[in-house]
Interface confidence: low
Amino acid sequence: GELETSDVVTVVLGQDAKLPCFYRGDSGEQVGQVAWARADAGEGAQELALLHSKYGLHVSPAYEGRVEQPPPPRNPLDGSVLLRNAVQADEGEYECRVSTFPAGSFQARLRLRVLVPPLPSLNPGPALEEGQGLTLAASCTAEGSPAPSVTWDTEVKGTTSSRSFKHSRSAAVTSEFHLVPSRSMNGQPLTCVVSHPGLLQDQRITHILHVSFLAEASVRGLEDQNLWHVGREGAMLKCLSEGQPPPSYNWTRLDGPLPSGVRVDGDTLGFPPLTTEHSGIYVCHVSNEFSSRDSQVTVDVLDPQEDSGKQVDLVSAS
């Protein structure tokens, strides 16, 4: 007869490991007992369990509650056992020794491999600001057995670097993603992808990039100077900018205080019916935690009466 087993049995941490050992004997042969031992123990073989054809399953105290026979129906020639809830310390060599009648004893070895799926963690780098050079955007660390693979999935252009630390029963892999921050990266996802034979599917952790910036400021509303005449209602100036974090707006007048009746509503400066008093230099001040910008415009309110007077003078002078 001969023993049928596996060279390697692979399970994920926490799963049951079936350690196979089947005696394929000739007609009339019987299995008296099957002894299972940990074969790589430093102080010699350590018994796990013994299956006896008459007295049943005996389990070593060190494995009490963790070693069982497979569920029925059972073949009397099958000496396989289940090792419940595999832990990393279970990884190693196991020996199955079968005592048969009348053929004698047979033994076989297998290796139990316990996969430890990683629990990845993603750590964002320092605050990203437009104008910085190559900067750490995020680092991703995963520890498992065997060593996991850590990669990045993103549309953002950048560079990666990885390093690995080996521990006694596992390995930790850290991958860093560096980039040159620009405002176009704002809101873009940066995903750490961890692959491992103990995972049903890749684990993904997504970090949304936030890049601080402040665009140049400009003022809209003076495109047609002819509209800025005495008596006009609803005149307004709007300050245009964008930033991350979103900026705040402040309006001042360079050549004096804001005239009475002028309303400041965030990025908009609203005027009452225009008078020549509203002529002046107005400054929009845009700021966020990253930077500040100014834009100034000159408002020249036309007085039609003054203009017609000037025209008459010009005509009479000719």
Partner: nanobody, 118 residues
Framework: EVQLVESGGGLVQAGGSLRLSCAAS????????MGWYRQAPGKQREYVAT???????NYADSVRGRFTISRDNAENTVYLQMDSLKPEDTAVYYC????????????WGRGTQVTVSS
């Protein structure tokens, strides 16, 4: 074949709590991932949370910090503790389990209704 039976659903006010249970007809040790999905009326089934046999967990962003998944391998049961419930959590909640033999096989329960009133 693995049978999954959910229980614990019901009607609860916004801000309240519920605990869903899912009992498996075989040892959950061999079910290396168990978890929960949900389906609101007229919407697609969406992922809620999963737990591995080793106890590692993962959650959808929409429930992270409010829901807690746990597992009792001795009782062959997985739980979903739902706190700070919102009306948008209203859905049929389905238990799922994956068994890996030569390839992954996914099993589903019949679902339990959770209704959150405002």
């Amino acid at each position: 074949e693995v049978q999954l039976v959910e229980s614990g659903g019901g009607l609860v006010q916004a801000g309240g709590s519920l605990r869903l249970s899912c009992a498996a007809s075989r040892s959950t040790f061999s079910l290396n991932i168990m978890g929960w999905y949900r389906q609101a009326p007229g919407k697609q089934r969406e992922y809620v949370a999963t737990i591995t046999s080793g106890g590692s967990t993962n959650y959808a962003d929409s429930v992270r910090g409010r829901f807690t998944i746990s597992r009792d391998n001795a009782e062959n049961t997985v739980y979903l503790q739902m706190d700070s419930l919102k009306p948008e959590d209203t859905a049929v909640y389905y238990c799922t389990a994956e068994l890996v033999r030569r390839g992954p096989t996914t099993y589903w329960g019949r679902g339990t209704q959770v209704t959150v009133s405002s």
